[in-house]
């Protein structure tokens, strides 16, 4: 089931999926002056069996016959209402994502790929937030959002991250920033999805690792 909306926007923060749930689609977008090959796929799809997940279809771009300067926009499958754009940088993997069943890792870039990636997320997808450069977390509660199905509608949980450009004024010096901690929250507050040990390790790493883990910047 596709998520109706994009993950929540948080002021001065970006989000990143550490892995993509099966069913996630990534549009095949090409940079200016290039287009999808005629027989090429509209999108890549994360699919898999019980032991292995991977991206079906390959995106391929070819030089446009008419090199106009307008941005190429890939047609959307009809049922998709929303799209999320991500700016491509180096495809470094922060954590071994292959260890998470039912999820695909970040697809490698393809030749002449557009600078933005447009994903269509599915129910159960989790994304992680951090403050952009020049800002810090004034408060970091659970800094993730999960796409959930409630009463037949999809919604994303609200991440509890507040970023500020001000200098630190902590009342308790030396106290570490908290980890995102799904366990221990009442049901109404819980991101009640994906709770494998591997993913919790990723969650903890996402909360503590340096900016470099967010190699794909979300617009």
């Amino acid at each position: 089931e596709l998520c109706d909306d994009d993950p929540p926007e948080i002021p001065h923060a970006t989000f990143k999926a550490m892995a993509y749930k099966e069913g996630t689609m990534l549009n095949c977008e090409c940079k200016r002056g290039f287009r999808r090959i005629k027989s090429g796929s509209l999108y890549m799809l994360c699919t898999g069996n019980s032991s292995h997940s991977s991206w079906d279809n390959q995106c391929q771009c070819t030089s446009s016959a008419t090199r106009n300067t307008t941005k190429q926009v890939t047609p959307q499958p009809e049922e998709q209402k929303e799209r999320k754009t991500t700016e491509m940088q180096s495809p470094m993997q922060p954590v071994d994502q292959a260890s998470l069943p039912g999820h695909c890792r970040e697809p490698p870039p393809w030749e002449n790929e557009a600078t933005e990636r447009i994903y269509h997320f599915v129910v159960g997808q989790m994304v992680y937030y951090q403050c952009v450069q020049g800002y810090r977390a004034l408060h970091r509660g659970p800094a993730e959002s999960v796409c959930k199905m409630t009463h037949g509608k999809t919604r994303w949980t609200q991440p509890q991250l507040i970023c500020t450009g001000e200098m630190e004024t902590s009342q308790f010096p030396g106290e570490e920033k908290p980890q995102a901690s799904p366990e221990g929250r009442p049901e109404s507050e819980t991101s009640c999805l994906v709770t494998t040990t591997d993913f919790q390790i990723q969650t903890e790493m996402a909360a503590t690792m340096e900016t470099s883990i967010f190699t794909t910047e979300y617009q």
């Epitope: 509660g141 609200q158 009342q171 106290e175 929250r185």
Partner: antibody, heavy 115, light 107 residues
Framework: QVQLQQSGPEVVRPGVSVKISCKGS????????LHWVKQSHAKSLEWIGI????????SYNPRFKGKATMTVDKSSSTAYMELARLTSEDSAIYYC????????WGQGTTLTVSS | DIQMTQSPSSLSASLGGKVTLTCKTS??????IAWYQHKPGEGPRLIIH???TLQPGIPSRFSGSGSGKDYSFSINNLEPEDIATYYC?????????FGGGTKLEVR
């Protein structure tokens, strides 16, 4: 269910200080930051500031720097706001609210400053 | 500081009708605006955040739209329980700022 329970009404003399409280329950207290908001006839709602319930980090509206001091006690899941050197202009209802989008609010604490 | 101008300051409407409130900001706030309903003797209630995202449990009669510096909030098919004061809040950067409020009354 999520609740923010605030302390009762206060009637105080000008020049003194007062400390009001906001106790969170029904959720993991340290997951959510807490905000304080002033409601007065003159200025409707005014955002006073925010405190991290996790580490006590704060950010104030410049208008309330030196007037309000926010603190938090994790052990009792309670946030406090002290208002100093009170004048009649501080008479108002003060609310606490939680989180990155103020999704739950306390019932308000009425402060009356009168000689 | 970013200024928030909410209008109108008061509004009289008929039950079953539609009302629209607006908030204008002095700078682009990138859709980081929320709307709250406030009734006497209670704490305010979050209705919409990030311009148009309805808070769970809020009826779909409520809606929000806008971008840049101009935002609006609408209530369709006005019901008696909608009578309240409504506030916008910009939260794109600290310190956050509320609009002046709109008192909604029934004609």
């Amino acid at each position: 269910q999520v609740q923010l329970q605030q302390s009762g009404p206060e009637v105080v003399r000008p020049g003194v200080s007062v400390k009001i409280s906001c106790k969170g329950s029904g959720y993991t207290f340290t997951d959510y930051a807490l905000h304080w908001v002033k409601q007065s006839h003159a200025k409707s709602l005014e955002w006073i500031g925010i405190i991290s319930s996790y580490n006590g980090d704060t950010s104030y509206n410049p208008r309330f720097k030196g007037k309000a001091t926010m603190t938090v006690d994790k052990s009792s899941s309670t946030a406090y706001m002290e208002l100093a050197r009170l004048t009649s202009e501080d008479s108002a209802i003060y609310y606490c609210a939680r989180g990155s989008n103020l999704d739950y609010w306390g019932q308000g604490t009425t402060l009356t400053v009168s000689s | 500081d970013i200024q928030m101008t909410q209008s109108p300051s008061s509004l009289s409407a008929s039950l079953g009708g539609k009302v629209t409130l607006t908030c204008k900001t002095s700078q682009d706030i990138n859709k980081f605006i929320a709307w709250y309903q406030h009734k006497p003797g209670e704490g305010p209630r979050l209705i919409i955040h990030y311009t148009s995202t309805l808070q769970p449990g809020i009826p779909s009669r409520f809606s929000g739209s806008g971008s840049g510096k101009d935002y609006s909030f609408s209530i369709n098919n006005l019901e008696p329980e909608d009578i309240a004061t409504y506030y916008c809040l910009r939260y794109d950067d600290l310190p956050w700022t509320f609009g002046g409020g709109t008192k909604l009354e029934v004609r």
